[in-house]
Structure formats: structure tokens, C-alpha cells
């Protein structure tokens, strides 16, 4: 009764198509698969960035797989062949591992890469990234930004740089069609006549770096003798009302400070007849139903009511 064995896949490699971190892992069927002609072979693929504690594992019937990686670090992957018991008329069989690695040979020392990279997707409409030049780089150093997301044929270079002292220190992106809820890859590389410049790679999803506009049209409405309803409108732009959280700051008579976080465009405030002045400001942020993270907007213009009529009438600006 000979033990059934199967070979690992052949020609296992990681291919970089130039998408700034979105890589192809590909392989060929194992040698001597003829014994298993009537059999659907599966492959277990494990991969990670070097230095990561955990492997990502997938099983596929295909000869390729694609995923995103951090190109600031190396990548390691391993794969083996899996035969379900139906292939062997006995128990499951797995091959030994085939292994491969990939890394971009780093140029320049780490200090030469851009510092403090910061990207904000303003009002879910305009992406702006800014950075500081690397430590100790000369004024002849210039940085170039490239970006890619699924849907683009190839990586694109920034066409509208923000400059300071002749150096690129940021990028204003064009309209990015169908670019949210998917990984957005950026590479900032550089050139200098004096020394090589280290490239930097960044990956994020645009919906998670949105900074909305502040809310508008703040109003007061007297609900009862001891209640005032504060109302505002969602900021102009493409972000739907269901995507907002709000933070309110309310001051009564320059002393009491109330802060609250709410999900819709109203807040009811308990007041006393002694209240002489009421002011509030609101800011907005994309909520957990539409993103995993976000940036608070600036505070709205302050809306105040002063005077003795506070307890009697509807209050508008």
C-alpha cells in the first residue's frame, strides 16, 4: 500500500505589475498531476509582509491570487497543493511548501524619504496629500507622487503639485472616479543629483480619511418653557445625511458648557428661565455606517441668542 504523495506547485512567484503595492501571486500546477486527472486540486496560499506576526491564508482552485502589500517592507509567501480524500480514495494529502519572497531594493537611506505624509479627502470630493522633505536632503531634491486604485489601467503621476521653495510638498488630486471603498495606493519617490532618495509607500481607503464641511443653517426653536431645540443642516456636498455624526458645543451665559454627540440634525436642550444667552457650534464627521474612520470638520459658525425673549419665542438668526 504505497503512500500517495503530491508535489508542490511549480514556478511560484510574486509579480509586481507596477500598482504600487497590489501584487500578483502566481504558480503552475505541480508535476506528475496525471495520477489525479479526475480530481479538482486546491492550493493553500499563505502570505505576509516580512515582520508581520500573522500569515493571511486562502485556499483557491486557481493558479493566481492578488492582494495588496506594504512595499516599504518585503513580502514572503508559501503555497502547497491540497488533495481532498476523493482524489486519493483515502485521506487528504498535502504537498510540501513552495516558498518565494519579493522586495523592492531600497535606494537611499531611510531619512531621505518624505516625512509626515498626511492625506485628507475633503468633503468626500477633493483629495489632498502633503508631506515634508526628508531629513537632511538638499534643495535640489524633488519628490514625485504616483497613485493607483482598482479601475485605473496604470499608476498615474500627480499633475498638480503643491510647492514650497521650488520643492514638491504635496499633491492636489483630480476627480477620482469610483475610488472609495477600495485600497488606494500611493508611492512618493524622489530624485537628487547628490544622493539616492528612499521611496515611501502608503495605502488607505478614501472613505476613511474624509473631512466634511461644517454643518450650516443653525437655528433655535422653543419647544416648551424649559426646552429649546437646536437644529442645523447637513453640509453641502455628496455626503448623504445617513453618513453623519455631529458634535455640539453649547454655552449658556458664558459659563455652562455642554457637549454632546448625536446622529441627526437636532438636539433638544433643557434650559431654565434664567438663561440670558445661548450659543452653540456644531461639527460633523463621517460615521461608522459609512466608514471605519474619519476626521472631524471645522466647527460651524457660532449661532447665539441674547436677550430676554429667549424664554418666549422662536429664535432665528
Amino acid at each position: 500500500d504505497t503512500e500517495i504523495k503530491v508535489n508542490p506547485p511549480q514556478d511560484f512567484e510574486i509579480v509586481d505589475p507596477g500598482y504600487l503595492g497590489y501584487l500578483y501571486l502566481q504558480w503552475q500546477p505541480p508535476l506528475s498531476l496525471d495520477h489525479f486527472k479526475e480530481c479538482t486540486v486546491e492550493y493553500e496560499l499563505k502570505y505576509r509582509n516580512i515582520g508581520s506576526e500573522t500569515w493571511k491564508t486562502i485556499i483557491t482552485k486557481n493558479l493566481h491570487y492578488k492582494d495588496g502589500f506594504d512595499l516599504n517592507k518585503g513580502i514572503e509567501a508559501k503555497i502547497h497543493t491540497l488533495l481532498p480524500w476523493q482524489c486519493t480514495n483515502g485521506s487528504e494529502v498535502q504537498s510540501s511548501w513552495a516558498e518565494t519572497t519579493y522586495w523592492i531594493s531600497p535606494q537611499g537611506i531611510p531619512e531621505t524619504k518624505v516625512q509626515d505624509m498626511d492625506c485628507v479627502y475633503y468633503n468626500w470630493q477633493y483629495l489632498l496629500c502633503s508631506w515634508k522633505p526628508g531629513i537632511g536632503v538638499l534643495l535640489d531634491t524633488n519628490y514625485n507622487l504616483f497613485y493607483w486604485y482598482e479601475g485605473l489601467d496604470h499608476a498615474l503621476q500627480c499633475v498638480d503639485y503643491i510647492k514650497a521653495d521650488g520643492q514638491n510638498i504635496g499633491c492636489r488630486f483630480p476627480y477620482l472616479e469610483a475610488s472609495d471603498y477600495k485600497d488606494f495606493y500611493i508611492c512618493v519617490n524622489g530624485s537628487s543629483e547628490n544622493k539616492p532618495i528612499r521611496s515611501s509607500y502608503f495605502t488607505f481607503q478614501l472613505q476613511n480619511i474624509v473631512k466634511p464641511l461644517p454643518p450650516v443653517y443653525l437655528t433655535f426653536t422653543r419647544e416648551s418653557s424649559c426646552e429649546i431645540k437646536l437644529k442645523w443642516s447637513i453640509p453641502l456636498g455628496p455626503i448623504p445625511a445617513r453618513c453623519f455624526d455631529y458634535e455640539i458645543e453649547i454655552r449658556e451665559d458664558d459659563t455652562t458648557l455642554v457637549t454632546a454627540t448625536v446622529e441627526n440634525e437636532t438636539y433638544t436642550l433643557k434650559t431654565t428661565n434664567e438663561t440670558r444667552q445661548l450659543c452653540f457650534v456644531v461639527r460633523s464627521k463621517v460615521n461608522i455606517y459609512c466608514s471605519d474612520d474619519g476626521i472631524w470638520s471645522e466647527w460651524s459658525d457660532k449661532q447665539c441668542w441674547e436677550g430676554e425673549d429667549l424664554s418666549k419665542k422662536t429664535l432665528l438668526r
Partner: antibody, heavy 121, light 108 residues
Framework: EVQLLESGGGLVQPGGSLRLSCAAS????????MGWVRQAPGKGLEWVSG????????YYADSVKGRFTISRDNSKNTLYLQMNSLRAEDTAVYYC??????WGAGAFDYWGQGTLVTVSS | DIQMTQSPSTLSASVGDRVTITCRAS??????LAWYQQKPGKAPKLLIY???SLESGVPSRFSGSGSGTEFTLTISSLQPDDFATYYC??????????FGQGTKVEIK
């Protein structure tokens, strides 16, 4: 006749634990990959976890990874799902299912009747 | 992850009608697709595997077709017992195994 019989469901508080069992009969249990699929009230089907046959390789949905553990005892023809750190969103009917063909998952040709897990304070 | 999208979400039909449900995968899954039928309070039941293979014991009025990203389940002549919810499921690459959101076939 293939039969899968789940047990172990019930009411548990958030943060609590439960262990589901699935007793299998009518087929050579150790040969087949098995899985757990759940269905929240009024919702669709969601795959939770899978395990290969004799090798026992395990696979999980991201939503339960690190909290749930699938295992099997081939000598007892039983599949298990240990559920820790339960959350309200884990409330569902949990089905045990047999994989028709494949290493760790595939088309599920037989299903148990399901056991209800309710996570609520 | 591979997303599976079914259409329509709800389908109103009469006994004897020819009914077609569509399932679309977010990337190619070759023919690694299954179809299930589920009735209220019951476990799902496998109808079709490998996109077009009829599971043993399933009536021949059920058929599956398609490959790559577009798949269909067809009921050639709807019977009273067929009013249920139908799910597609991919098993090309996992984890996770993914299901469509379901199509409810109801009486017109």
C-alpha cells in the same frame, strides 16, 4: 441516511461563551470537510468557519476570527464550535453542514436543523 | 473577498411560470458555484453544485448555468413547493465562503 444534529445553543450575555456540537451519522465523518453557517433573524446566510477532514486545517470568517474555534473529534463523529467573547451581532441560527467535495469548504450537501444562539443582556 | 450579488431580491410568479434568478460574482469563480433553496424555519437544501450539476434527488425542473462571473438558476415550470428563498454561494476561493443575499420567490 446522512444526519447532522446540532446542540448547545441558547441565551448568553454579551462577552459570554457557548460551545455548539454537531453529531454526524450516515457517512464516513473523518473523510469530509465540515463547516458552520449562520443566519441572523430575517437575514441571509453567512459562512462562519470550516475544517478539513482528517488533517483538521481550520478556516474562519474575519467577523469571528480570534473569538471562535472550530474543531472535530473524528472518533466521536462530532463537530464543535467554541464561541467566546460573544456579541449581539452573533445572534443567529447556527447550522452545521457537510462539504460535498473539497479541502476546507465547498458546496454543502447536507445541513443540520440549526441551533439558535441569542446574545443579549 | 469575492462578493456575490443576486437579482432580483424578490420575484413574484405563478405556478407554471418559468423563473430565472441571476447571481453575479465580483470576480471570476470559474464554475465553483452552488444554489440552495430555503423555506422558512428550515435549513437550506442544495439544488445545484459546480454551477450546473443537479444534486441527487432534486427535480429536473431546476437547472443552473453560467461560468466566470454570471450565473443563473432556472425553474422551468414553477410548482407550489418551489415558493422559497434561493441563495447562490461561491467556493472558488476562501476564506470566506460567500453567499448571495437571497432571492425570495413569492406567489403573484
Amino acid at each position: 441516511e446522512v444526519q447532522l444534529l446540532e446542540s448547545g445553543g441558547g441565551l448568553v450575555q454579551p462577552g459570554g461563551s457557548l460551545r455548539l456540537s454537531c453529531a454526524a451519522s450516515g457517512f464516513t465523518f473523518r473523510k469530509y470537510a465540515m463547516g458552520w453557517v449562520r443566519q441572523a433573524p430575517g437575514k441571509g446566510l453567512e459562512w462562519v468557519s470550516g475544517i478539513s477532514g482528517s488533517v483538521g486545517s481550520t478556516y474562519y470568517a474575519d467577523s469571528v476570527k480570534g473569538r471562535f474555534t472550530i474543531s472535530r473529534d473524528n472518533s466521536k463523529n462530532t463537530l464543535y464550535l467554541q464561541m467566546n467573547s460573544l456579541r449581539a451581532e452573533d445572534t443567529a441560527v447556527y447550522y452545521c453542514a457537510k462539504v460535498r467535495y473539497g479541502w476546507g469548504a465547498g458546496a454543502f450537501d447536507y445541513w443540520g436543523q440549526g441551533t439558535l444562539v441569542t446574545v443579549s443582556s | 473577498d469575492i462578493q456575490m450579488t443576486q437579482s432580483p431580491s424578490t420575484l413574484s410568479a405563478s405556478v407554471g411560470d418559468r423563473v430565472t434568478i441571476t447571481c453575479r460574482a465580483s470576480q471570476s469563480i470559474s464554475s465553483w458555484l452552488a444554489w440552495y433553496q430555503q423555506k422558512p424555519g428550515k435549513a437550506p437544501k442544495l439544488l445545484i453544485y459546480d454551477a450546473s450539476s443537479l444534486e441527487s434527488g432534486v427535480p429536473s425542473r431546476f437547472s443552473g448555468s453560467g461560468s466566470g462571473t454570471e450565473f443563473t438558476l432556472t425553474i422551468s415550470s414553477l410548482q407550489p413547493d418551489d415558493f422559497a428563498t434561493y441563495y447562490c454561494q461561491q467556493y472558488d476561493t476562501y476564506p470566506p465562503i460567500t453567499f448571495g443575499q437571497g432571492t425570495k420567490v413569492e406567489i403573484k
